[in-house]
Amino acid sequence: AVNGTSQFTCFYNSRANISCVWSQDGALQDTSCQVHAWPDRRRWNQTCELLPVSQASWACNLILGAPDSQKLTTVDIVTLRVLCREGVRWRVMAIQDFKPFENLRLMAPISLQVVHVETHRCNISWEISQASHYFERHLEFEARTLSPGHTWEEAPLLTLKQKQEWICLETLTPDTQYEFQVRVKPLQGEFTTWSPWSQPLAFRTKPAALGKDT
């Protein structure tokens, strides 16, 4: 089978996608491998081809249906297998039972836009993408703003502990270029993790009004 130098990690986007990464030290780059998904209470099954993403790491996306279709629920268990071709047959490399709603990673928020901008403030909104209706309002967000002369890693994180798809940034500097990103996470799930960061939204604060002559 596979020794401790192998890892098989998958996440469900809460709708119709399971993304998987399989890594194994010493595996050949040109080995042909697949992930098979077999739900315990569904009539469908799905396969994706693992493609190399680094020297010893492969990834693929199991597309379960239309992007906004609800293909799995909180009671589903999906058996995931990694299979690699050995000559004319496929060899099972790993088997994992996967509870999708314990392993959530949503899509990055989309449609970021500036609602209103002033000299020191900016109101920004966004939308969540392909997120299950099961969450209702049980989501949280993190946001960060890139200031001139700093890196994203230095940007302080702003936490929104509720489903709030907007933010009012304050104490900004007038006539200054900024960038803004946001990410989302459901509150449920043993291994649930943050979505990727959204695409950055660039905006500029308004210049300060010129003082009147006295």
Epitope: G4, S6, Q7, F8, T9, Q96, D97, E102, E190
Partner: nanobody, 127 residues
Framework: EVQLVESGGGLVQAGGSLGLSCAAS????????MGWFRQAPGKEREFVAA????????MYAVSTEGRFTCSRDNAKNTVYLQMNSLKPKDTAIYYC????????????????????WGQGTQVTVSS
């Protein structure tokens, strides 16, 4: 720390099914990853399955061929191993084990990763 007691072993014909249980007492069950191992006569202890603290991920030995299902009930402090389509080669003593360190459920753990072991239950599959 927890103490583990397995039950459910016995004699079964090839092609039959058997369900093992492992009851934990004396600790916080949900803070342990749980595993099943087996040891056939004259052979080394072999990994069968391991499940994470919340049961969100469970890894299975390839040798189980999808015939076994491991699950846990943290409310009942119990981990289960349902074995279907049993074969004579599944004959072994089956051990339940608990891991105090964090387990991500993304790799195959070694027996040395587990700190606490049950006394084992015999499973015999006749042809």
């Amino acid at each position: 720390e927890v103490q583990l007691v397995e039950s459910g072993g016995g004699l079964v014909q090839a092609g039959g099914s058997l369900g093992l249980s492992c009851a934990a007492s004396g600790g916080t069950f949900s803070s342990y990853a749980m595993g099943w191992f087996r040891q056939a006569p004259g052979k080394e202890r072999e990994f069968v399955a391991a499940t994470t603290r919340g049961g969100g991920r469970t890894m299975y030995a390839v040798s189980t061929e999808g015939r076994f299902t491991c699950s846990r009930d943290n409310a009942k402090n119990t981990v289960y191993l349902q074995m279907n389509s049993l074969k004579p080669k599944d004959t072994a003593i089956y051990y339940c084990a608990a891991m105090t360190s964090y387990y991500s459920g993304t790799y195959y753990p070694d027996s040395s990763d587990f700190d606490i072991w049950g006394q084992g239950t015999q499973v015999t599959v006749s042809s």
